[in-house]
């Protein structure tokens, strides 16, 4: 109707990076920008994704290099993390959130795709990492190896080999395992502290240089106490699981101290593995019973999990795997390992700013049934799996509903702010829920809408619209972009209007009647009044229309509802040649060129497009006859 299609500003970017996947208009003290997500952008050797700031009138885009942001104390994997897959602007302070839902970190032998977001302040400076689903690894362990280096240990090289082999099994790195080694005989010395080395390679290198210090006495109690009171303190981390591995070849010369030493270790929650090396006993034909009892006493209970004995130093290599496996069986403690909580949550797949924080969709949470998490300045709210059961029953738990594929919120005069989330795969047809979140990790689900058609992806896009700008939501639009009709993926947008406290179905928006795939409803944007009639409007993207060139549809708001017939359809081919997937993202909240009219930003594959609004001239015709 009044969007200019003759002089769009087409901002080019990388197609391979999918520059344009998300777009947001941005205002910094009067200067207008587009923030553009490029979730496949490369940073160095990694395809991290990134976000660009683009001036709206002329000039080139600048990469914000958010892909370089690193989290300390985790072993991160940023490759393919899809930074920029979701963007959410906070109009209050003009900060925005850029999410990397496939950001993952190493935990033992697994990579956990918890996702994370970067908060960027109004002047495009990174300010904070938001990662509510990030949990400590079960391999967050401080391991101190207590090595008997007394004279009777022979040959030392076998002990060294054992040490190196066991270290190679450890997942050493930030947020995972730290290893320290002490050696004892008559005295105890730190060979290296817990925080001296940060990789397996470095620890192994250090261990290969440990020499036998000797000693006529074997003061095992002293060695254990030294490890407990000193080694775990120097470089030890708060909250890390404390593990001690004691390797000795004979009865201790200070065994009367063991009772108190072990009591103190228990008090400090040190899990003790103890290895009895029987070489000295076997070489001399001595009965090792007393020695074995002592080592069992040192080992944590139960002995069958924590106690090992080997015939001689050379046989140490035979227990490397078993010892490693026992230590890492601590990973699964009290967990049903066939089930995922937040480990694969992909938090930030969608995002939405609310008054007190940000809502983040986590499609992979709870075995891909999904969840919505909330991060506030006061902390985070992570609803329990059980809180969704009312609408996501147990019997469908293996279906992967993908709740959190999109998140938004509505405001009703009675209930205030209510959150909305889509689960496009729920029971194959899709579902949308309206809910409030509580600090005790429960939810109150107020309403649910279900999709009609299997595979339609109902709920993959949701937008709330305040038509008259009174602060109360009038219309909720739900996209089902894969809706199949007349032999094609046509797409459908469902309209729900607020009546008292419920949203009531009120038909669908009309698209154009073409015989190709369209995916109408892939993106739905509530935009400020485009046609100057004082009602806010809606723009819907159909990025597969016109043989994947894409198109957008403009629907006008009117008296608390939305007119279901589009007032303007803009195809990519009208604007520029070579545009593809035009309409994959849309944002229209700002006047970008200072003409007093709201302008549109539309994403495409490798491009961001700005469409300028034109003024609407109201002509009131009146006939005047003379003589009357």
């Amino acid at each position: 109707f009044n969007m200019d299609t003759r002089k769009p500003r087409v901002i080019p970017g990388s197609r391979t990076a999918f520059f344009g996947y998300t777009v947001q208009q941005h205002d910094i003290s009067g200067n207008k920008w587009l923030v553009v997500g490029a979730p496949l952008e490369t940073n160095g050797y990694q395809k991290t994704g990134d976000v660009y700031k683009c001036p709206v009138i002329h000039g080139n885009c600048t990469k914000l290099n958010l892909g370089r942001v690193t989290l300390s104390n985790v072993s991160e994997r940023k490759d393919n993390m899809r930074l920029g897959l979701s963007l959410a602007t906070n109009p209050k302070d003009n900060s925005f959130l850029a999410c990397s839902p496939l950001w993952s970190h190493e935990c033992g032998s697994s990579y956990y795709t918890t996702g994370m977001c970067s908060r960027v302040n109004s002047n495009f400076r990174f300010s904070k990492t938001v990662a509510p689903a990030l949990q400590r690894c079960q391999t967050y362990m401080d391991i101190v190896i207590v090595l008997d280096g007394s004279n009777s240990i022979y040959p030392w090289v076998e002990v060294q080999h054992f040490l190196i082999n066991i270290l190679k099994k450890f997942y050493i790195g930030p947020g995972q395992i730290q290893v320290g080694v002490v050696q004892y005989g008559e005295d105890v010395v730190h060979e290296f502290h817990l925080n001296d080395y940060r990789s397996v390679k470095d620890v192994v290198e250090a261990a290969s240089h440990i020499e036998q210090r000797g000693g006529t006495e074997t003061r095992t109690a002293f060695g254990i106490e030294f490890a407990r009171s000193e080694a775990f303190q120097k470089g030890g981390r708060k909250g890390a699981k404390k593990v001690m591995i004691v390797i000795t070849d004979g009865e201790s010369h200070d065994s009367p101290d063991l009772e108190k030493v072990i009591q103190q270790s228990e008090r400090d929650n040190v899990t003790r593995y103890a290895v009895a090396v029987l070489g000295y006993y076997n070489r001399r034909g001595i009965n090792p019973e007393t020695f074995l009892n002592e080592i069992k006493y040192i080992a944590s209970d139960p002995d069958d999990k924590h106690f090992f004995n080997v015939t001689d130093e050379a046989a140490l290599k035979d227990i490397v795997d078993a010892l490693g496996d026992r230590i890492f069986s601590l990973e699964g403690t009290n967990k049903n390992e066939t089930s995922f909580g937040l480990e694969m949550s992909q938090t930030g797949f969608s995002s939405h700013v609310v008054e007190d924080g940000v809502l983040l969709g986590a499609v992979g949470a709870y075995d891909w049934n999904g969840a919505v998490l909330k991060e506030t300045s006061a902390g985070k709210v992570i609803p329990l799996r059980e809180s969704y059961l009312k609408e996501f029953p147990e019997e469908l738990k293996n279906h992967g509903a993908y709740l959190g594929y999109t998140v938004t919120s509505v405001v009703s005069s009675r209930q205030g702010r209510v959150y909305v989330a889509g689960a496009p795969r729920f029971n194959h047809t899709g579902k949308v829920i309206l809910f409030t979140m509580h600090n005790n990790r429960s939810l109150t689900i107020h309403q649910a809408m279900r999709g009609q058609q299997i595979g339609s992806y109902f709920g993959s896009e949701i937008t709330s619209v305040d038509i008259d700008g009174d602060g109360v939501t009038d219309v909720l639009l739900v996209g089902a972009p894969m809706y199949f009709n007349e032999g094609r993926e046509r797409g459908k947008v469902y309209v729900y209007e607020l009546r008292q406290n419920l949203f009531v179905y009120n038909g669908t928006l009309k698209d154009s009647h073409s015989y190709q795939n369209a995916r109408f409803g892939s993106s739905i944007a509530s935009v400020r009044d485009l046609n100057q009639d004082s009602y806010n409007d809606v723009v819907v993207g159909a990025p597969l229309e016109d043989n994947h060139a894409g198109a957008i549809y403009i629907f006008h708001g009117f008296r608390g509802s939305i007119l279901k017939t589009p007032k303007q359809r803009i195809t990519a081919s009208e604007l520029a040649t070579g545009l593809q997937y035009f309409g994959c993202s849309i944002h229209g909240q700002l006047d970008l060129n200072e003409d007093g009219l709201i302008d549109l930003a539309v994403g495409a594959l490798g491009n961001a497009v700005i469409l300028w609004s034109r003024p609407v001239v109201q002509i009131n015709a009146s006939l005047h006859f003379e003589p009357s």
């Epitope: 008559e186 006495e217 009865e251 200070d254 065994s255 009367p256 101290d257 063991l258 002592e294």
Partner: antibody, heavy 120, light 109 residues
Framework: EVQLVESGGGLVQPGGSLRLSCAAS????????IHWVRQAPGKGLEWVAS????????YYADSVKGRFTISADTSKNTAYLQMNSLRAEDTAVYYC?????????????WGQGTLVTVSS | DIQMTQSPSSLSASVGDRVTITCRAS??????VAWYQQKPGKAPKLLIY???SLYSGVPSRFSGSRSGTDFTLTISSLQPEDFATYYC???????????FGQGTKVEIK
């Protein structure tokens, strides 16, 4: 030659204090444990307290807990038994003895004993 | 705490007799049991350690054995210098708490 020599015994009034010493020679106190054992007139042996000179861990018999304190000074190769709030039933000959790994945790060397008499 | 019950409390025997003294532990203990000999006015002397090992310098007529929670000191042929009081002693494992038996006085018949 291994030797343990006790000193510090004597007559003390009930409620009084005494400090016994056990001077060790011929071995290093640091690698052993010292026990104090007492024997009341005409009675059997009663274990009193022990110390690991190396770690300073201590153990006490219930009858003396809170009143007696065992300590060691490895630089002087001497162990001590500080006895406070003495009672008539603490009257005994007090022996110190060595306890270590090489005697399989038996008391292999004993001092000659020092007599403590608690009487008004 | 483990109690060591020693029996008999006294016995009369002649030179050349075989003498047996028993200590019973109140609960299962390690083999860290020792036997001492004490003569009037003297400090005790170690005879047996680890239940059955003869301490150096101790005549071989002295021996020790264990059966479950029962520990036995045997003097195979009593000599005049053996008339004394004998004590068993148990060491609590992994601590330096020790317990003595009540003693057995061996007198000349």
């Amino acid at each position: 030659e291994v030797q343990l020599v006790e000193s510090g015994g004597g007559l003390v009034q009930p409620g009084g204090s005494l400090r016994l010493s056990c001077a060790a020679s011929g071995f290093n106190l640091d690698s052993s444990y010292i026990h104090w054992v007492r024997q009341a007139p005409g009675k059997g042996l009663e274990w009193v307290a022990s110390i690991s000179s190396h770690s300073s861990y201590t153990y006490y018999a219930d009858s003396v807990k809170g009143r007696f304190t065992i300590s060691a000074d490895t630089s002087k190769n001497t162990a001590y038994l500080q006895m406070n709030s003495l009672r008539a039933e603490d009257t005994a000959v007090y022996y110190c003895a060595r306890y270590w790994y090489y005697s399989a945790w038996a008391l292999d060397y004993w001092g000659q004993g020092t007599l403590v008499t608690v009487s008004s | 705490d483990i109690q060591m019950t020693q029996s008999p409390s006294s016995l009369s025997a002649s030179v050349g007799d075989r003498v047996t003294i028993t200590c019973r532990a109140s609960q299962s203990v390690s083999s860290a049991v020792a036997w001492y000999q004490q003569k009037p006015g003297k400090a005790p002397k170690l005879l047996i350690y680890s239940a059955s090992s003869l301490y150096s310098g101790v005549p071989s007529r002295f021996s020790g054995s264990r059966s479950g929670t029962d520990f036995t000191l045997t003097i195979s042929s009593l000599q005049p210098e053996d008339f004394a009081t004998y004590y068993c002693q148990q060491s609590a494992p992994y601590s330096s708490l020790i317990t003595f038996g009540q003693g057995t006085k061996v007198e000349i018949k």
